[in-house]
């Protein structure tokens, strides 16, 4: 297959890092973390058609070369740039779905309705979802022991980089009405330190976004307050009106019901409110 | 002052093969995409292949260019190179190489561009 | 494959006249609006214009302008002046990081 051909190519031993070196408060890097971008890059190229031609050989080097030899408290955005445009994806801008803290709803969403794209239906935030990675600065080593956590080491990590700069593109690149997923079972319904609060929103484009729209998704069965009406809700309104879009928001009181008449929206009983 | 300058094109034979160099001078080279463009005699314009060399060379090609054409980089001698093997009558064209702009906000287009080297196959 | 089709692919006009060149792509661009507008003149390298669809490149007079999005775009030449005879290309940027050039319009004097 393709991608035996990649790694007989390529004759790469990843070697992990030895216990002695420097300690990082997060998990390492994902076992076998070259051999997932790797094909996980060759399924979704086979899968969409317009990504048909991305090279993965090139996309895992760009990705390698990212965070390989750089120290992990050292990483920028432009380190990431390569990989960006090797990864660049013309998705259709007025069918973006953002989402904080509630991934995997926003997931089964989209996976219903196919014409629906979150970041990680896109191939750069397929190859990275649910992984962890880092290097070592002067070393061509990756390291499987630990990694820094964005709290308790720094910020500037492989990983919250890469979540920061590919976010951003995402929502520069959406248009018309954009949709965000929040979770209305948490304390901040709305969190403008998480990366839809403090990336995404800031990057999404006036001249381009008409409307974001907000679906506050209820988690108690029995739960029929108006959580638009949330103070962190008329916060995210307030710096959404601040940059000339306008905000509309809607409570998913059923999020069980809510995806139900997503796939099937001719029963009669998704006539009345979800 | 920004400049790029292409060498080596020629007459060629068809099945032939010819190198084409594109020196850089007056900026950062490593910090830029580098992209060969073609154009053939009277016709409109054709992206050939893309490098980026921060770290390792990070390049990719047009489809209808890949297996015949190779872009490499020398950062010591500040040269991109254009490798072109199995040539055929319509690869005959004046043949640039361009300097992306830089930024996430600018990438996808060329600001600077060299004077051109034709090939004739 | 991508095809970008400009239309006219001439055009004549009188100094001071407005002129409107218009770019279609087979498939949106990047973002909706990566596309991009060069000028050539005869053996030489194209010049950047705008780029973003609308945006001027520096030092190109304000008679430039561009509007569109998605698969269709124009460039507008407000007045044009003896210096703008010459080649326009659209230039689109697409998924994969990859290029795509319409087959130009050349815009010469009636």
């Known amino acids: 297959s393709g991608l035996n051909d990649i790694f007989e190519a390529q004759k790469i031993e990843w070697h992990e890092v030895p216990r002695w070196r420097q300690q990082w408060s997060g998990p390492g890097t994902t076992k076998r973390f070259p051999e997932t971008v790797l094909a996980r890059c060759v399924k979704y190229t086979e899968i969409h058609p317009e990504m048909r031609h991305v090279d993965c050989q090139s996309v895992w080097d760009a990705f390698k070369g990212a965070f390989i030899s750089k120290h992990p408290c050292n990483i920028t955005e432009e380190d990431y740039q390569p990989l960006m445009k090797l990864g660049t994806q013309t998705v259709p801008c007025n069918k973006i779905l953002l989402w904080s803290r509630i991934k995997d709803l926003a997931h089964q969403f989209t996976q219903v309705q196919r014409d629906m794209f979150t970041l990680e239906d896109t191939l750069l935030g397929y190859l990275a979802d649910d992984l962890t990675w880092c290097g070592e600065f002067n070393t061509s080593k990756i390291n499987y022991q630990s990694c820094p956590d964005w709290r308790k080491d720094c910020s500037n990590n492989p990983v919250s980089v890469f979540w920061k700069t590919v976010s951003r593109r995402f929502a520069e690149a959406a248009c018309d009405v954009v949709h965000v997923m929040l979770n209305g079972s948490r304390s901040k319904i709305f969190d403008k330190n998480s990366t839809f609060g403090s990336v995404e929103v800031h990057n999404l484009q006036p001249e381009k976004v008409q409307t974001l729209e907000a679906w506050v998704i209820h988690g108690g069965r029995e739960d029929s307050r108006d959580l638009c009406q949330d103070p962190t809700i008329k916060e995210l309104e307030s710096i959404i009106s601040k940059r000339n879009i306008q905000f509309s928001c809607k409570n998913i009181y059923r999020p069980d019901k809510f995806l139900q008449c997503v796939k099937n929206p001719e029963d009669s009983s998704c006539t009345s409110e979800i | 002052e920004v400049q790029l300058l292409e060498s080596g094109g020629g007459l060629v034979q068809p099945g032939g093969s010819l190198r084409l160099s594109c020196a850089a001078s007056g900026f950062s080279f490593n910090n830029y995409w580098i992209i060969w463009i073609r154009q053939a005699p009277g016709k409109g314009l054709e992206w050939v292949a893309a490098?980026?060399?921060?770290?390792?060379?990070?390049?990719y090609y047009a489809d209808w260019a890949k297996g015949r054409f190779t872009v490499s980089k020398d950062n010591s001698k500040n040269t991109v190179y254009l490798q072109m093997n199995s040539l055929r009558a319509e690869d005959t064209a004046v043949y640039y190489c361009?300097?992306?702009?830089?930024?996430?906000?600018?990438?996808?287009?060329?600001?600077?561009w060299g004077q051109g080297t034709l090939v004739t196959v | 494959d991508i095809q970008l089709t400009q239309s006219p692919s001439t055009l004549s006009a009188s100094v001071g006249d407005r002129v409107t060149i218009t770019c279609r792509s087979s498939?949106?661009?990047?973002?909706?609006?990566?596309l991009a507008w060069y000028q050539q003149k005869p053996g030489k390298a194209p010049k950047l214009l705008m780029y973003r669809a609308s945006n001027l490149a520096s030092g190109v007079p304000s008679r430039f302008s561009g509007s569109g999005s998605g698969t269709e775009f124009t460039l507008t030449i407000s007045s044009v002046q003896p210096d703008d005879f010459a080649t326009y290309y659209c230039?689109?940027?697409?998924?994969?990081?990859?290029?795509?050039f319409g087959g130009g319009t050349k815009v010469e004097i009636k």
């Open positions: 490098i980026y060399s921060p770290s390792g060379d990070i390049k």
């Open positions: 498939q949106s661009v990047y973002g909706h609006n990566w």
């Open positions: 361009a300097r992306e702009l830089s930024g996430s906000a600018y990438e996808g287009y060329f600001e600077s």
């Open positions: 230039q689109g940027y697409y998924s994969g990081g990859s290029y795509a």
